[in-house]
């Protein structure tokens, strides 16, 4: 679809005569008829296959035709066509004299023709005007012409329809050849697909407008390349959505069970070695000079009372030193220069000669000790309390304060974690060194058998005679749907054959 445009510029008829040579009275009131048709080697009369157009009276005898495209579109003259421009044409321009106001062909005398020109040739679609001038014996016509495409038609022959658009069926403008030119941010044959944010994951992300990255279910992140782990996953990751793969040192469905308390909490102090011993459980092996569950207590080397025979102990940076009482010597004041004659035994201790009187030994009464019975017995010295219990002196006796989970005089008994019946739904409880474990009955799971998991009561194929089995999830029992001809809770009896009861 396009338009053949003809711009009349100047007509010269100096003598004001008709084609017959007869003069116009009072002058030649000139109008034009234009015929556009298919290419003919010799332009001949006949139908104007591409269209016709007539002008009003434009002037008398000789005149210039002004551009009147704004005021009604009379010049240039428009000859629209609704077909593919063939690239060739024939054009006939006739100048007529109008004696009156009626310009219809039938209203004019045949000799009112002033001049007639006919041209033919090739013409490509384009914006440029072709200027031409045709001269006859008495007249001269100057004009220009061109072919342009109608709105929304493009290409060499105006055959390509293209309408710019900016909606979800396309975001484009039209190129001169009628091809689409996508607006920034759009792609695809019809420019309807947005170009997502650079790096947006091809499968897991998408977009509805340019530079966007919307994530499909199970994915997250600016580029939708991070999977979303299982809801509640604490110390775990995923490689596909809804997974919960535990980080090292964590366990359980949600990776919330600490299997590496040592690394995550560093409970052992003063350079002690930590050993994991179960979920949230650990043991500290203390370096020399330290004690306590977490090796948090500094041991004085004098605490073990290494000095004998009443020697006093002094802590030193690299150990300890014994200051011996008179009559004793040695690293621990273990050597005596005394004999029983010197009455070396205190607190009622009895003296016994040894090595022919060169040495002696004291036999101490109860509650006293030491090589000279000089020390009151500290009943806690021997660390009698097991499992980290704290020893307390109570006059002549002693007492152990136990850590949670232990009992007994010396904290030697492990309190049964199972005593509280922690396993739900009839689960069996097992005491472990550092906690407990529940063995759950069928249909239950979880650390305390608290989660009901449906058992497939139909798994054992309890129904006979090709009956359909259904599991009742509320009671974990089965129901048999009998085929025709069978009855009974398991469809075991044929209809008409009553069961043989034992009574």
């Amino acid at each position: 679809s396009g338009v053949f445009q003809l711009q009349l510029q100047e007509f010269i008829n100096e003598r004001g005569v008709l084609a017959s040579g007869r003069p116009c009275e009072p002058g030649c009131r000139t109008f034009f008829r234009v015929c556009l048709k298919h290419f003919q080697a010799v332009v001949s009369p006949g139908p104007c296959t591409f269209g016709t157009v007539s002008t009003p009276v434009l002037g008398t005898n000789s005149f210039a035709v002004r551009d009147d495209s704004s005021g009604g579109g009379r010049n240039p003259l428009q000859l629209p066509f609704n077909f593919t421009w063939p690239g060739t044409f024939s054009l006939i321009i006739e100048a007529w004299h109008a004696p009156g106001d009626d310009l219809r062909p039938e209203a004019l005398p045949p000799d009112a023709l002033i001049s007639k020109i006919a041209i033919q040739g090739s013409l490509a679609v384009g914006q440029n005007w072709l200027l031409d001038e045709q001269t006859s014996t008495l007249t001269r016509l100057r004009y220009s012409y061109r072919v342009i495409c109608s709105d929304n038609y493009y290409g060499d022959n105006c055959s390509r329809l293209c309408k710019k658009r900016n909606d979800h069926f396309g975001h484009y403008v039209c190129q001169p050849d009628g091809n689409l030119s996508c607006l920034p941010g759009w792609t695809g044959e019809y420019c309807q697909q947005p170009i997502c944010l650079s790096g947006c994951h091809e499968q897991n992300g998408y977009c509805s407008k340019p530079a966007e990255c919307l994530c499909r279910p199970g994915w997250q992140g600016r580029l939708c390349n991070e999977c979303i782990p299982h809801n509640g996953c604490r110390h775990g990751t995923c490689s596909t959505p809804w997974q919960c793969t535990c980080d090292e040192g964590w366990g359980g469905l949600f990776c919330d069970q600490d299997l590496n308390y040592c690394t995550h909490h560093s409970p052992c102090k003063n350079g002690a070695t930590c050993s994991n011993s179960g979920q949230r459980s650990y043991t500290c092996t203390c370096r020399p000079g330290y004690t306590g569950v977490d090796c948090e207590l500094e041991l004085s080397e004098c605490d073990s009372n290494p000095c004998r025979n009443g020697g006093s102990c002094k802590d030193q940076e690299d150990g300890y030193h014994c200051l011996c009482p008179p009559g004793y010597y040695g690293l621990h004041c273990e050597h005596s220069t005394l004999s029983c004659a010197d009455s070396p035994c205190f607190n009622g201790g009895s003296c016994r000669e040894r090595n022919q009187g060169a040495n002696y030994a004291c036999e101490c009464p109860p509650n006293f000790t030491g090589s000279n019975c000089e020390k009151k017995v500290d009943r806690c010295t021997s660390n009698p309390c097991a499992n980290g219990g704290q020893c307390l002196n109570r006059g002549p006796s002693r007492m152990c304060r136990c850590r949670p989970g232990f009992t007994g005089t010396y904290c030697e008994l492990h309190v049964s974690d199972c005593a509280r019946n922690p396993c739900a739904h009839g689960g069996t409880c097992h005491d472990l060194e550092n906690g407990l474990m529940c063995t759950c009955p069928a249909g239950f799971s979880g650390r305390r058998c608290e989660v009901r998991t449906s058992i497939d009561a139909c798994a054992s194929s309890p129904c006979f005679n090709r009956a359909t089995c259904y599991t009742d999830l509320s009671t974990d029992t089965f129901v048999c749907n009998c085929p025709y001809g069978f009855v009974g809770s398991r469809c075991e009896f044929p209809v008409g054959l009553p069961p043989s009861f034992p009574w």
Epitope: D151, N166, D167, G170, G188, Y206, C207
Partner: antibody, heavy 121, light 106 residues
Framework: EVQLQESGPGLVKPSETLSLTCTVS??????????WGWIRQPPGKGLEWIGD???????YYNPSLKSRVTISVDTSKNQFSLKLSSVTAADTAVYYC?????????????WGQGTLVTVSS | LYVLTQPPSVSVSPGQTASITCSGQ??????ASWYQQKPGQSPVLVIY???KRPSGIPERFSGSNSGDTATLTISGTQTMDEADYLC?????????FGGGTKVTVL
């Protein structure tokens, strides 16, 4: 040959939500060349475009219905769905699903047979 | 709000030409589609992209679109062409239908 089939309740009470599903057979809903639309026609009246959806989930709605309409797509089932909330008697119509072809510049070349939804208490 | 206006009815004799118009502001800058709908049936696309026919649509259906008016022309109208005809165009991201024209073959 592509076929579209609407399904859903034929009677909805006023103020409730109308829900319809369109099942596509004979072609993939995940093609980049198509949008999948809903159009309705009240008894004795013309067609009214409700909205459409792309396989990615991008939706476009008629501004006059936008506040009440939700269209969704399930590519795994080759289905797309319409939900219209707070219905009144004015929503009584034959509801059609249709395929809108990008290559046909948005022309709808395949339609479902339509399902009449009546809004009444 | 974009509106497409169609005459409610057009009558034509068998074998004659029926022209149905659809007008809307600058409709010529949009692509027009035409649908035929017979009573109790779903619409059928007869013209898309102003003047193109889908496969299976007879040649007697043609279309044009320029200025503010799109036109559907049925040449050599047959009794089987008696139906409602609806035009459609897209305004931004919204589908818009004309009110429909009832074509009666006398």
């Amino acid at each position: 040959e592509v076929q579209l089939q609407e399904s859903g309740p034929g009677l909805v009470k006023p103020s409730e939500t109308l829900s319809l599903t369109c099942t596509v057979s004979g072609g993939s809903i995940s093609s980049s060349s198509y949008y999948w639309g809903w159009i309705r026609q009240p008894p004795g009246k013309g067609l009214e475009w409700i909205g459409d959806i792309y396989y990615t989930g991008s939706t476009y709605y008629n501004p006059s219905l936008k506040s009440r309409v939700t269209i969704s797509v399930d590519t795994s089932k080759n289905q797309f769905s319409l939900k219209l909330s707070s219905v009144t008697a004015a929503d009584t119509a034959v509801y059609y699903c249709a395929r809108e072809d990008v290559i046909l510049r948005g022309g709808s070349d395949y339609w479902g047979q339509g399902t009449l939804v009546t809004v009444s208490s | 709000l974009y509106v497409l206006t169609q005459p409610p009815s057009v009558s034509v004799s068998p074998g004659q030409t029926a022209s149905i118009t659809c007008s809307g502001q600058r409709l010529g800058d949009k692509y027009a589609s035409w649908y035929q709908q017979k009573p109790g049936q779903s619409p059928v696309l007869v013209i898309y992209e102003d003047s193109k026919r889908p496969s299976g649509i007879p040649e007697r259906f043609s279309g044009s679109n320029s200025g503010d008016t799109a036109t559907l022309t049925i040449s050599g109208t047959q009794t089987m062409d008696e139906a409602d005809y609806l035009c459609q165009a897209w305004d931004r991201d919204t589908g818009v239908f004309g009110g429909g024209t009832k074509v009666t073959v006398l």
